[in-house]
Interface confidence: medium
């Protein structure tokens, strides 16, 4: 009987730039699905005590519970579910209608930020720490959710993990992105990209740490066995990672067209809105089904590239099939064809 | 009626402390952490920190994590924070202020301490 | 930290007039977590617009919010006297939870 109290029970918080609040999803055996605020015979509008969903927050590392209650309704992604029984219970869930639905957020307390220690790593004869290991994931400052340099921490030790690009480790992504509450392993990122460059205006909150760790068995199924420590190296790679639960997801919308169910795709590169321009990766419908449940549309009704006959119209390019793949977007300065889709209307 | 009632205005000797507290009534206190925000005579608002009503668990602006401490008492319903080492910089307005489910807004305020650092 | 910008500082509006005050942030927030307080002189600070664009109860219609990512704005389509006050935005969509410096809404 799966609940959020077993230890398998996979979550996530949504819909902010914390890992540590939002809108509760929840991975059961189909995928993640948003769980409705009307779950477990309570109203929409209903609070709950916080410390219910203790273990939630903690599987996410976060602190305790701050508030269990309704999140606005801003967002809807395209599988939402109600459920029955005791709260926190998934195990008799049925699908609900969008429209009905009232997101459940979850605030936590962030972490402290603790500095770590910048100590030389303790002698070999210190007794190993008995805190539990744990994986944390540090993005650049405003950078994403589930992306960036990956550091193991086992007790009070903690550093990033040395990777050479020979290292044959897929298993062991996918084992570290689950266990991080961020889905399954995309792609590795460039140190750049994953948090180490840095503003020169910005103070330093992760300091190199003290020690670094090597991959040791890439098959590993608990984190105590995955990693060994070694002396920290001057030069070399570290382990950085996108995982598909990255936050903030790329947002589309419908321009032109006679209601907002239809119309040229355009998507948000920071504050910029701009034309979406048609990819050979992206020629089946799945990539115009998720612009269609993200505008909460029905599905595809038809979709249409236009001719892209002026070498100067701009845009953006996504290089994944679906847009929520989509970790950044490129930009084409010419040639760029945009794309008309046509969904249905839940309100014609 | 939701009501959060602070205690009254303090004149504090630099270098001294004081304990502000703020009274939660008409509500389930533990159901909803309490913030702390400070507005200076420039009149900006600055979060200083929260706790947990729950579990006494809090986290702190790093600008004020060595100058201001928040605590509970369940049993009276009450939240408190105490600021050390004050100087004529702390003089200011401290606001309590409920923190309103998972879009963390704050929905009731109190009405403020008056805090005045000087010899 | 996330940086917000409101502007103007101070605005002088005759009865009737649309006004629009905006806050910007230094990087993206989700729209879920920006909020804006009116504080009226020397009382506290009251929750206005939750969630960019929602009224908190009592707040008469002709005040609204917008705004998406770095940019969001609070309007009042005809102001009246009663709406002289400083109306504050706030996010916490990043760690730590931030405020803007403040509008302050004068009525001639």
């Known amino acids: 009987r799966l609940s959020w109290y077993d230890p398998d029970f996979q979550a996530r918080l949504t819909r902010s730039n914390s890992k540590c609040q939002g809108q509760l999803e929840v991975y059961l055996k189909d995928g993640w699905h948003m769980v409705c605020s009307q779950s477990w015979g309570r109203s929409s509008k209903q609070w709950e005590d916080p410390s219910q969903a203790s273990k939630v927050c903690q599987r996410l590392n976060c602190g305790v519970p701050l508030s269990l209650g309704p999140f606005l309704v801003t967002y809807t992604p395209q599988s939402s579910i109600i459920c029955y029984g005791q709260l926190g219970s998934f195990s008799n869930c049925s699908h609900s209608r969008n429209d009905m639905c009232h997101s459940l957020g979850l605030t936590c307390l962030e972490p402290q930020k603790t500095t770590p220690p910048t100590t030389r790593p303790p002698p070999t004869t210190t007794p190993e720490p008995t805190a539990p290991p744990r994986l944390q994931l540090v993005a650049q400052s405003g950078g994403q959710h589930c992306a960036g340099v990956v550091e193991f921490y086992s007790g009070s030790l903690g550093g990033t993990i040395s990777y050479e690009a020979q290292d044959k480790t897929q298993d062991l992504e996918n084992f570290l992105c689950n266990n991080l509450q961020c889905g399954s392993f995309l792609k590795h990122l460039p140190e750049t990209e994953a948090g180490r460059a840095q503003d020169p205006g910005e103070p330093r909150e992760h300091q190199p740490l003290p020690i670094q760790w090597k991959i040791q068995n890439s098959s590993c199924t608990s984190l105590e066995h995955c990693f060994r420590k070694i002396k920290p190296q001057k030069s070399g790679r570290v382990l950085a990672l996108l995982c598909s639960g990255f936050q903030p997801k790329v947002q589309s919308r419908l321009v032109g067209g006679s209601s907002i169910c239809e119309g040229t795709v355009e998507v948000r590169q920071g504050a910029q809105w701009a034309a979406l321009c048609d990819s050979s990766s992206a020629r089946s419908s799945l990539r115009w089904e998720e612009v269609c449940r993200e505008q909460q549309c029905g599905s595809v009704n038809s979709y249409r590239v236009l001719d892209a006959g002026d070498p100067t119209s701009r845009g953006l390019f996504c290089p994944h099939q679906k847009l929520s793949q989509c970790h950044e977007l490129w930009e084409r300065n010419s040639y760029c064809k945009k794309v008309f889709v046509t969904c249905q209307d839940p309100n014609p | 009626e939701v009501q959060l009632k602070e205690s009254g205005a303090e004149l504090v000797r630099p270098g001294g402390s004081v304990k502000i507290s703020c009274k939660g009534s008409g509500y389930t206190f533990t159901n909803f952490a309490i913030h702390w925000v400070k507005q200076s005579h420039i009149k900006t608002l600055e979060w200083i920190g929260l706790?947990?009503?729950?579990?006494?668990?809090?986290s702190y602006n790093q600008k004020f994590k060595d100058k201001a401490t928040m605590t509970v008492d369940k049993s009276s319903s009450t939240a408190y924070m105490e600021l050390a080492r004050l100087t004529s910089e702390d003089s200011a307005i401290y606001y309590c202020?409920?923190?309103?489910?998972?879009?963390?807004?704050?929905?009731?305020w109190g009405q403020g301490t008056l805090v005045t650092v000087s010899s | 930290e996330i940086v917000l910008t409101q502007s103007p500082t101070i605005m002088s509006a005759s009865p009737g007039e649309q006004v629009t005050m905006t806050c910007r942030t230094n990087?993206?927030?989700?729209?879920?977590?920006l909020h804006w307080y009116q504080q009226k002189s020397g009382a506290s600070p009251k929750l206005w617009i939750y969630?960019?664009?929602n009224l908190a109860s009592g707040v008469p219609t002709r005040f609204s919010g917008s705004g998406s990512g770095t940019s969001y704005s609070l309007t009042i389509s005809s102001v009246e006297a009663g709406d002289a006050a400083t109306y504050f935005c706030q996010q916490y969509s990043g760690y730590p939870l931030t405020f803007g410096g403040g509008t302050k809404v004068e009525i001639k």
């Open positions: 202020a409920r923190h309103y489910g998972a879009n963390n807004y704050f929905d009731y």
């Open positions: 706790i947990s009503t729950s579990s006494g668990d809090v």
């Open positions: 990087s993206s927030v989700s729209s879920s977590y």
């Open positions: 969630g960019t664009s």
